[in-house]
């Protein structure tokens, strides 16, 4: 008896991070023997969708004409051949941006920083959130991912960098999200350009461990002063 059918490949075009209202196409590629393709979405009744293969039968297209919250989530696909159903594909995480208003990103004490010194990037959201993502332009993955440990919602997250090196220079944005769906992100913040100056010999960049994220001093504008001090966001390096 032949072994299990090879798992198909699942991907999204133009990508897996899609702005609200934009179109996205999910592709599932199996083998030429495929007769039918099935797409499952986690926590949705299976199958989420079924499609006949496109010629030459080795792949199927699942179209989302306008991205909304309902489409965000984790997908897997399968194909059926004359001998049965394949193994599931690796998961595809379809993320929607634009679910919430954009946070604001600041560099403290300044976006102009001398090599070897410290800087903290501060991401502040309009409504309380429990997850904050810091993205560096042209980096493959989120640089930092801060998540509340106890579901405590915060209006801000701090991303300390120390000691700063030339590697830290570049353009950053941040996103915020709610714990009930990490597939729904805010609009991106306006970009922040971090400029590292100085010719000190660059030590190897290392993240600091501090994760202070309580609402700030009493004068902090339009932020709640009653949030639990240092309830903490857990840092994930990715």
């Amino acid at each position: 008896q032949a072994g299990p059918l090879p798992k198909p490949t699942l991907w999204a075009e133009p990508g897996s991070v899609i702005s609200w209202g934009n179109s996205v196409t999910i592709w599932c590629q199996g083998t030429l023997e495929a007769r039918e393709y099935r797409l499952d979405k986690e926590e949705s009744p299976a199958p989420w969708d079924r499609q006949n293969p496109l010629e030459p039968k080795n792949k199927a297209r699942f179209s989302i004409p306008s991205m909304t919250e309902d489409y965000a989530g984790r997908y897997r696909c399968y194909y059926r051949s004359p001998v049965g159903w394949s193994q599931p594909s690796d998961p595809l995480e379809l993320v929607m941006t634009g679910a919430y208003s954009k946070p604001t990103l600041s560099a403290l004490p300044s976006p102009l920083v001398t090599s070897g010194k410290s800087v903290t990037l501060l991401c502040q959201s309009r409504s309380p959130m429990d997850t904050f993502l810091l993205i560096k332009e042209r980096a493959a993955h989120p640089l930092l991912h801060l998540r509340s440990e106890h579901g405590a919602q915060q209006h801000q997250a701090e991303f300390p960098m120390s000691p700063v090196t030339s590697v830290h220079g570049g353009t950053y944005r941040c996103f915020s999200s709610h714990g009930f769906s990490h597939y729904l992100l805010s609009h991106p913040s306006d970009p922040l350009e971090l400029i590292v100056s100085g010719s000190l010999e660059d030590p190897r960049p290392s993240p600091t461990r501090s994760v202070s994220t309580a609402a700030g001093p009493e004068d902090q504008p339009l932020m709640p002063t009653g949030s639990v001090p240092h309830s903490g966001l857990r840092r994930h390096w990715e």
């Epitope: 609200w20 909304t68 634009g98 954009k102 604001t104 501060l122 502040q124 309009r126 504008p221 339009l222």
Partner: antibody
């Protein structure tokens, strides 16, 4: 395209109540605060209050507490403002506006309210 | 409540002229937490709703021409139009979003000479 479409002009008698609506489209409705702003004839802008469609949270300018009540209908992506015990002082253009970070990036076209006997 | 004062109340200008208008707040709008000034500027043309021009005192909203520039910090702010066009004739309002209730200035009306 983000749009906030407000209901049409209202002519009401003193002492009556009125409900004006603001239908949002072109964005993720539940994730953005909607505020209301009053502009009396020839005057500046006064902030009335906000509602957060996701959970119905509201906050009001002390001046408009008891005068304005904000509600949301998520199924139709609509925010409503009811104004009660109307007097001539309430005659104005009322705007709904989408909050970005406490400032307003999109505004409705305005609803003119005239209170007259 | 934070009081916003704008001056002048009206301004007669010629097309091509450089224009500055002032907005003062009764308390500082500069946050110690993020070093940002919680001030926005709006443009309102006759019969239209306000339109966001500037936020964080100096960040231009997407699509706003670069002849509009915001500056200032703390309690004193300025909106500058480097070369006025006929389409810029409008009332300009500043708004503080440092604390509730949100408050607006009385506006500066830009008119043709």
């Amino acid at each position: 395209e983000v749009q906030l479409q407000q209901s049409g002009p209202e002519l009401v008698k003193p002492g009556a109540s009125v409900k004006i609506s603001c239908k949002a489209s072109g964005y993720s409705f539940t994730g953005f605060y909607i505020d209301w702003v009053k502009q009396s004839p020839g005057k500046s802008l006064e902030w009335i209050g906000y509602i957060f469609p996701s959970n119905g949270e509201t906050s009001y300018n002390q001046k408009f507490k008891g005068k304005a009540t904000l509600t949301v209908d998520k199924s139709s992506s609509t925010v409503n403002m009811q104004l009660n015990s109307l007097t001539s002082e309430d005659s104005a253009v009322y705007y709904c506006a989408r909050q970005a970070f406490y400032y307003f990036d999109y505004w409705g076209q305005g609803t003119t309210l005239t209170v007259s006997s | 409540d934070i009081v916003m004062s704008q001056s002048p109340s009206s301004l007669a200008v010629s097309v091509g002229e450089k224009v500055t208008m002032s907005c003062k707040s009764s308390q500082s709008l500069l946050s110690s937490s993020n070093q940002k000034n919680y001030l926005a500027w709006y443009q309102q043309k006759p019969g239209q709703s306000p339109k966001l021009l500037i936020y964080w005192a100096s960040t231009r909203e997407s699509g706003v021409p670069d002849r509009f520039a915001g500056s200032g910090s703390g309690t004193d702010f300025t909106l500058t139009i480097s070369s006025v066009k006929a389409e810029d004739l409008a009332v300009y309002y500043c708004q503080q979003y440092y604390s509730y209730p949100l408050t607006f200035g009385a506006g500066t009306k830009l008119e043709l000479k």
